[in-house]
């Protein structure tokens, strides 16, 4: 749905959320371009690009939440992700520098699309939360443990270390969005029923 407008059709909204999370778990849209731009596209370096456990809520944690609690946790986590992405964007080379070093400008454009895409997803999360609040059966909200604070980056000793931190963060983000997609795929066909 367009930012600021809400579909009142549960299955349209759920479809949009499923589509958005499907696209956001795709590493070719964020992690892969980041790796190329930062010069980490070397087997030995990629090995260091594994997420730190606990940086994002686990799939098990997400599955244990009620639908409202899940949306709250997802929203909070994405809020942290937006801050971290803004920080990463600041450290990216500029377009003209990329061209000079023979790197692909499309990679930079993909990275710059990440934040608008997350804002679109958050809009639909807000819409779904509204829809669930208006549906007849109130489901007890199991409070999420909030977003287990994504990625406070460890103080990076140098620029290279920061690149690796960014890489681990994005790896974790894609894995988290994969988990989110799996949770959404189990939601029922009506706002009053959840298959878990």
């Amino acid at each position: 749905a367009a930012i600021g407008s809400c579909s009142k059709e549960y299955r349209v909204l759920l479809g949009q959320l499923q589509k958005q999370t499907d696209l956001m778990q795709d590493t070719s849209r964020l992690l892969d371009p980041y790796i190329r731009i930062q010069g980490l596209d070397v087997p030995k370096l990629r090995e260091h690009c594994r997420e730190r456990p606990g940086a994002f809520p686990s799939e098990e944690t997400l599955r244990g939440l009620g639908r409202r609690g899940f949306l709250q946790t997802l929203n909070a986590t994405l809020g942290c992700v937006l801050h971290r992405l803004a920080d990463l964007e600041q450290r990216l080379p500029k377009a003209q520098d990329l061209e000079r070093s023979g790197l692909n400008i499309e990679d930079l454009e993909k990275l710059q699309m990440a934040r608008p895409n997350i804002l679109g997803l958050r809009n639909n999360i807000y819409c779904m939360a509204q829809l669930l609040d208006n549906s007849d059966t109130a489901e007890p909200t199991k409070a999420g443990r909030g977003a287990s604070q994504p990625p406070t980056p460890t103080p990076a000793s140098d620029a290279f270390q920061r690149k690796l931190e960014g890489c681990r963060f994005l790896h974790g983000y894609h894995r988290f969005m994969h988990s989110v997609g799996r949770v959404f795929s189990k939601w029922g066909e009506s706002p009053n029923r959840s298959r878990r």
């Epitope: 407008s5 579909s7 349209v12 499907d22 679109g120 066909e189 009506s190």
Partner: antibody, heavy 120, light 106 residues
Framework: QVQLVESGGGVVQPGRSLRLSCAAS????????VHWVRQAPGKGLEWVAV???????DYNAAFMSRFTISKDNSKNTLYLQMNSLRAEDTAVYYC??????????????WGRGTLVTVSS | EIVLTQSPATLSLSPGERATLSCSGS?????MYWYQQKPGQAPRLLIE???NLASGIPARFSGSGSGTDYTLTISNLEPEDFAVYYC?????????FGQGTKLEIK
């Protein structure tokens, strides 16, 4: 391979009813949403209705009162019951599959269509 | 419902040329989908999620856009590309199609 084959079209008088069928093969209707989309002669495409894998349905408001979508999972077949037909319902009716088990309202596989002509 | 307006209604080009087809929404949509239809045949999905090529679609097809304005580009027209093209949205209920752009041989 994944295939959809429509049948049941033909010439029918205004006010009468008709039931279209769509036989699915290569996938199970319990795993995907399947839609009806129609196309009047020389015109564009118009979404009619969908039945999701769990059996819930959604309709274009323009057809909700006269058309009913249903399926028989054991036969892997989709149906469209059309009542009180009008001349403007004359069209090729296609069944089309959603691309995965999620609530995706677009269509990666289409049948060849069946022509319904409403005429006295 | 969201009305999708395609332009031009008819586009006359020669093989080897580049075709640019537009689709404009009456409201903003998240993603756009494009289909190709040849006479007497069912539509075929070309582009999903605005810019992703559907399975088996050649790389000369590409999609772009955001908000209310979307574009399908065919970079190097082949004889088999001459057909009618439809855009489709499902950000808002019900799903709707554009009225189509007919791409014909000049």
């Amino acid at each position: 391979q994944v295939q959809l084959v429509e049948s049941g079209g033909g010439v029918v008088q205004p006010g009468r009813s008709l039931r279209l069928s769509c036989a699915a093969s290569g996938f199970s209707l319990t795993n995907y949403g399947v839609h009806w989309v129609r196309q009047a002669p020389g015109k564009g495409l118009e979404w009619v209705a969908v039945i999701w894998r769990g059996g819930s349905t959604d309709y274009n408001a323009a057809f909700m009162s006269r058309f009913t979508i249903s399926k028989d999972n054991s036969k892997n077949t989709l149906y469209l019951q059309m009542n009180s037909l009008r001349a403007e319902d004359t069209a090729v009716y296609y069944c089309a599959k959603s691309p995965n088990s999620n609530f995706y309202w677009y269509f990666d596989v289409w049948g060849r269509g069946t022509l319904v002509t409403v005429s006295s | 419902e969201i009305v999708l307006t395609q332009s031009p209604a008819t586009l006359s080009l020669s093989p080897g040329e580049r075709a640019t087809l537009s689709c404009s929404g009456s409201s903003s949509v998240s993603y756009m989908y494009w289909y190709q239809q040849k006479p007497g045949q069912a539509p075929r999905l070309l582009i999903e999620d605005t810019s992703n090529l559907a399975s088996g679609i050649p790389a000369r097809f590409s999609g772009s856009g955001s908000g209310t304005d979307y574009t399908l580009t065919i970079s190097n027209l082949e004889p088999e590309d001459f057909a009618v093209y439809y855009c489709q949205q499902w950000s808002s209920y019900p799903p709707t199609f554009g009225q189509g752009t007919k791409l014909e041989i000049k």
